[in-house]
């Protein structure tokens, strides 16, 4: 299988100069890093930072949103060392986690106001915050937290270079005063659980203090990474040894300790993926280990199965897993040795951006009941990373992407198999964004970010689909790239579409081109399946190219015809002639099958020999439905682009156009009178149908109505009849 | 940059009373909540008294209530603790601190800043 590329679709969108100065202020002293990331939340925002300065910017034009610059109490400025998306009582804004001399300062800004509206002391060097929860108090929204943590109005988990892990109260139920950084409040940390959480809580506060309950004491090993998982109502957190624990927050205990394959290498992210329908109350957890840009050169990817007692759906809809039974490595992926042929020595391979997508069935589609707990049919991960190699002055740059339902579909392999690349595995998808880098360089990239909305495996080529479809290698999608000079936006197409697109591209020599693309189509699985156990060499050039067409129509890839036609009519040449007779038979007789097609699915419809039409048969007579637009469309581009036809040619041509158009609405109705409960007919003419489309009596009344107001306008002169 | 300067320190008898001052610089104390601490001789720091922002509130370490009075003056910018009725225990060195990070029982695992420090010395 060919590489999969990475398009970029927009020019450089540069941050504005004013962000570009304040970032740039601070990059001379040596402690200060250019961090950015996008923010993980719906509001489409990336924060970059650099030293005591903070820029927010819009994730889409690279606009400038909010800025500020920390001051500290210290003679060196503080250092923002953590930023996390938050939003609470309608505001939206962030946690920020500042590095001084002497601890570490929390801050709540509000994005609104371009301000600090909280700040607390933290002991140590924060190196990682997550919201846990952005409200308070013992309601049902909290149930799923420990006793002790309801009391307080907001935690965020806090963890620092020492190990410390600490849960903070972040009175959000008292925010009658603005304070900024320098006015931060004191902090009391309690470690275990006192059982008059309110009591001391009320006492901390009006001493000007926030209360915090300490996880773990400090151990002398750095926290890496830090995530809560909503639906399983876990703390993950990584160590720099290559631990990884996962902490319960209902019971406030750690359920799980354990040291990941690659050994003492950092725990630099977690995400977390769930599978659609696992009847053993299972999901997922990968833990990347990365030594970044320090010594050594690893970067792995593990996966973790976590297998729970219960699954739940709550009032608020969201799913709850409880009752770990147990945690157990399923897969690794080793990113820097050779998993993958790359030419040369690698040097140094860093993770850029890990991120998990779900896409939920719409309600008209599930069988579930309401009530159900759903999962995602949907469910892939993201991960993006840089390889430098020696020698070489450009990075190169991945995408990969895990799809876990094809995962578990290849009998959830522990690894790749011997001789299995990355990019012809079944699960899992690679993408070269070398022309990111190309058009980019030599801005450092800080991270990627797909789109989820975008995400998408485009029009079957056929009923069932072929196995080829549900690859992940099929996904289209677009993604933006956080540079340190502003944003760019790239697409990621699948096998099939980028296949359609050579095709597309081939153009006038596409006589060439058959056996390339006919091969192309039929491994990326655009063709039919009676062709998938035939020898392309046993097909002559005429059957390869009905079999592309077939292919452009069923996916709706009209614009390859179309091209093709054009073309043909306005550069003659040798060929031009028998391909445009060709591809014009082709497209009648194919009308004249789907038509036949659609007439056979339809019998049951009028002979009253049944009640109801099976989703199988609707969805077959909407793809007949579907062909017919799309021949439509071709014969519509022969009429309106023939010339030097004779008189006979061009009846014939505009007779074929209104026959299929003609077709194509009589199809449509059809749908309709189905759709509407008014088709399949029934033999028993007063069988009540379950619902009309149209109200009588409000039309009736309607009418009346009108009637009345004519005759009294025209004074008895107007004649209804 | 925030400085603390305390000054007042000496050595007394028991009973006696002292009065210490901690000037600030870079920072204002009508807008911070502050705090006296203290390290007896071989101890961690302890927290002695806070005086909130707007000069309200005023609390106090069990060992030193009814006792110690920790007050400020907006317009010197400058914090005081009166200790009245000294016990040899109380002898440390007596800092005034900003942005206190401590467990339940008082003890303070960190400071964000403060000065460096007058003793106080309570004879016998």
């Known amino acids: 299988m060919r590489d999969l590329r990475a398009q970029v679709t927009s020019g450089l969108l540069p941050f504005p100069e004013v962000t570009l100065q304040a970032l740039g202020e601070d990059e001379i002293t040596l402690e200060s890093v250019l961090r950015g990331k996008f923010a993980a939340g719906k509001n489409g925002l990336a924060c970059l930072a650099c030293g005591p300065q903070l820029e927010v910017v819009n994730s889409i034009t690279g606009e400038r949103l909010s800025a500020y610059r920390f001051s500290g109490v210290n003679e060196q400025p503080p250092v923002v060392l953590a930023v996390k998306e938050f939003s609470w009582q309608k505001r939206t804004g962030l946690l920020i986690g500042l590095e001084e001399t002497e601890g570490s300062v929390l801050c709540l800004y509000d994005l609104g106001i371009s301000k600090v509206v909280k700040a607390v002391v933290l002991p140590g060097r924060v190196t990682a915050i997550e919201p846990i929860i952005n409200h308070g108090g013992a309601s049902a929204s909290t149930q799923h937290l420990h006793p002790s943590l309801r009391w307080l109005f907001g935690v965020a988990a806090v963890v620092t270079d020492v190990g410390q892990i600490l849960l903070v109260d972040l009175c959000l139920d008292d925010l009658s005063c603005n304070q900024n950084e320098v006015e931060a409040s004191d902090l009391e940390v309690l470690t275990g659980i006192p059982a008059e959480v309110p009591h001391i809580r009320e006492s901390v506060m009006r001493q000007g203090r926030h209360l915090c309950f300490q996880l773990v004491s400090p151990t002398g090993t750095a926290v890496s990474t830090l995530s809560y998982i909503s639906r399983t109502n876990q703390l993950a957190v990584g160590f720099s040894d290559g631990y990884l624990a996962l902490w319960n927050m209902k019971s406030m205990k750690r359920e799980y300790y354990i040291q990941l394959e690659s050994g003492q290498v950092p725990v630099y992210a977690v995400t977390f993926q769930e599978p659609e329908n696992d009847p053993r109350n299972c999901c997922y957890l990968w833990a990347v280990q990365s030594t970044q840009d320090s010594e050594g050169d690893v970067l792995s990817l593990h996966l973790l199965q976590l297998a729970f007692g219960n699954r739940k759906c709550l009032a608020s809809g969201q799913i709850l897993y409880e009752g770990l039974e147990y945690c157990e490595e399923r897969y690794t992926l080793d990113l820097t040795g050779g998993m993958f042929p790359l030419r040369g020595q690698t040097s140094n391979t860093k993770l850029l951006g890990c991120q998990s997508i779900e896409k939920f069935r719409s309600h008209g589609d599930r069988e579930e009941g309401v009530n159900e707990a759903l999962s995602p049919d949907t469910s892939v991960s993201v991960f993006t990373w840089q390889v430098n190699i020696y020698g070489q002055g450009k990075p190169s740059v991945y995408l990969g992407l895990f799809d876990i339902n094809r995962w578990y579909h290849a009998q959830m392999p522990d690894s790749l198999r011997s001789g299995e690349y990355l990019h012809n595995c079944s699960y899992f998808a690679l993408w070269s964004l070398e022309s990111v880098v190309s058009r980019t360089s030599p801005h450092g990239i800080l991270d990627i970010l797909v789109h989820e909305r975008s995400l998408n495996r485009g029009v079957p080529p056929s009923y069932p689909p072929p196995e080829q479809f549900f690859n992940p290698s099929t996904y289209n999608f677009d993604a933006t790239c956080l540079l340190n000079s502003g944003v760019v936006h790239l697409t990621c197409t699948g096998f099939q579409k980028e296949t359609l697109t050579f095709l597309k591209k081939s153009g006038p020599s596409l006589n060439e081109l058959i056996p390339d693309g006919y091969n192309r189509c039929l491994v990326a699985g655009l063709l039919s399946p009676r062709f998938v156990d035939v020898q392309p060499s046993s097909l002559s050039q005429e059957e390869q190219l009905e079999a592309i067409l077939s292919a452009a129509i069923q996916t709706s890839s009209l614009g390859l015809l179309t091209g093709y036609i054009r073309r043909w009519i306005t550069e003659e040449q040798p060929n031009s002639a028998t391909n445009l007779r060709f591809v014009l038979e082709w497209t009648w007789n194919k009308v004249v099958l789907t038509k036949e097609e659609f007439d056979r699915l339809c019998v049951p419809l009028f002979d009253g020999s049944c009640h109801f039409m099976d989703p199988q048969t609707i969805q077959s007579i909407q793809q007949c439905y579907l062909l017919l637009s799309n021949l439509n469309i071709v014969l519509s581009c022969f009429a309106s682009e023939a010339r030097e036809i004779t008189e006979r040619g061009l009846i014939d041509l505009s007779n074929k156009f209104v026959v299929s158009h003609l077709i194509c609405q009589y199809a449509q109705v059809v749908l309709w009178f189905s759709h509407s409960g008014l088709l399949p007919e029934g033999i028993d003419d007063s069988v009540q149908l379950s619902r009309l489309c149209y109200n009588y009596p409000v039309i009736q009344n309607y009418y009346t109505s009108r009637r009345q107001k004519f005759e009294r306008l025209s004074r008895g002169k107007w004649n209804p009849d | 940059q925030v400085q603390l300067v305390e000054s007042g320190g000496g050595l007394v008898h028991t009973g006696d009373s002292l009065r210490l001052s901690c000037a600030a610089s870079?920072?204002?104390?009508?807008?911070?909540?502050i705090s006296w601490i203290r390290q007896p001789p071989g101890r961690g720091l302890e927290w002695v008294a806070k005086?909130?922002?707007?000069?309200?509130?005023?609390f106090y370490a069990d060992f030193v209530k009814g006792r110690f009075t920790i007050s400020k003056d907006s317009t010197k910018n400058t914090l005081y603790l009166q200790m009245d009725n000294l016990d040899a225990e109380d002898t440390a060195m007596y800092y005034c601190?900003?942005?206190?990070?401590?467990?339940?029982?008082?003890?303070?695992?960190?400071?964000?800043?403060r000065g460096q420090g007058t003793q106080v010395t309570v004879s016998s």
């Open positions: 601190a900003l942005g206190l990070v401590q467990d339940s029982q008082g003890l303070v695992l960190s400071s964000r800043a």
């Open positions: 870079g920072l204002d104390l009508s807008r911070v909540g």
């Open positions: 005086i909130l922002a707007d000069g309200t509130g005023a």
